[in-house]
Amino acid sequence: PKQTLPKPIIRAESTYMVPKEKQATLCCQGSYGAVEYQLHFEGSLFAVERPKPPERINGVKFHIPDMNSRKAGRYSCIYRVGELWSERSDLLDLVVTEMYDTPTLSVHPGPEVTSGEKVTFYCRLDTATSMFLLLKEGRSRDVQRSYGKVQAEFPMGPVTTAHRGSYRCFGSYNNYAWSFPSEPVKLLVTGDIENTSLAPTDPTFPDSWDTCLLTRETGLQKDLALWDHTAQNHHHHHHHH
């Protein structure tokens, strides 16, 4: 069988949801010594980067200016060391946002609930869309989808304190073109049905995978690079529609 290098890791810097006309940045983390990185969009070559010097950096950034619906979709990357190519990375879904209109997000029975209460979010958008998306701040990969003519329901079932946080919704014109985000709605969940005093919300952190982890080689890094790269590939969870 034809020999290939381990697949690279593709990430979006800061977020995979990019407002229209803004710049998207995708990182392809490959290997020290890679002389060429290729970014593929919907299966076709989109861009090429050649790191300088190749032996000192383990990846590259691809800048995609002026984001629009034609540039939104599935990206992957590969890299080359000498004449040897890597396997293709997992697919990354890049979404353009701030298209057309702004939905309204609401929550029943209210923004303050007790653990065990049934909560339902509603996302409403009067323009032509049938797919709606609900995202929790700091958990933007955990997208919930629902369908409806002008409004979609997101039943959360009986909630726990793990549901605390700030939520936004989008209307989706296709898988990769989303509306402006709704105003956020913060959900406060107190510990139990008897205790209705307010508890603080859990802190939210940026998505840890929405960060480019490109490093310049120093000392031991080269020896650890292949092991580390293989481990990351093994544990990396990619985003699927």
Epitope: S106, H108, P109, T114, Y122, P184, V185, I193
Partner: nanobody, 121 residues
């Protein structure tokens, strides 16, 4: 035809009590909320009850003084208000399946017409 009709408002001395009623007809609801609106102020959540489960929730400003309950047989929801204060003066509304939309705004397809509660000092 869906209707929510409040009653029981009136003038009461500080420290006194009132019981408001909300008659719900026309369909079944998941929740009934009570709200109030004082002159020049935004509509404010007071209390809610789940129709089947009877689970209740109260705004911090009324907790321990107000009690929401319901009578399934009569399709009625009640708000028992004790230890009333002048700051409880407002028009009180009941609403069915109300939803919060952020920035202290609430929406519902079904609102009552309201009943005036005045607490004198």
């Amino acid at each position: 035809d869906v209707q929510l009709v409040e009653s029981g408002g009136g003038l009461v001395q500080a420290g006194g009590s009132l019981r408001l009623s909300c008659a719900a007809s026309g369909r079944t609801f998941n929740t009934i909320h009570w709200f109030r609106q004082a002159p020049g102020k935004e509509r404010e959540f007071v209390a809610r009850i789940w129709w089947i489960e009877r689970t209740t929730f109260y705004a911090a400003s009324v907790k321990g003084r107000f009690t929401i309950s319901r009578d399934n047989a009569k399709n009625m929801v009640y708000l028992q208000m004790n230890s009333l204060k002048p700051e409880d003066t407002a028009v009180y509304y009941c609403a069915a399946d109300a939803r919060y939309t952020g920035s202290r705004r609430w929406e519902s397809d079904y609102w009552g017409q309201g009943t005036q509660v005045t607490v004198s000092s």
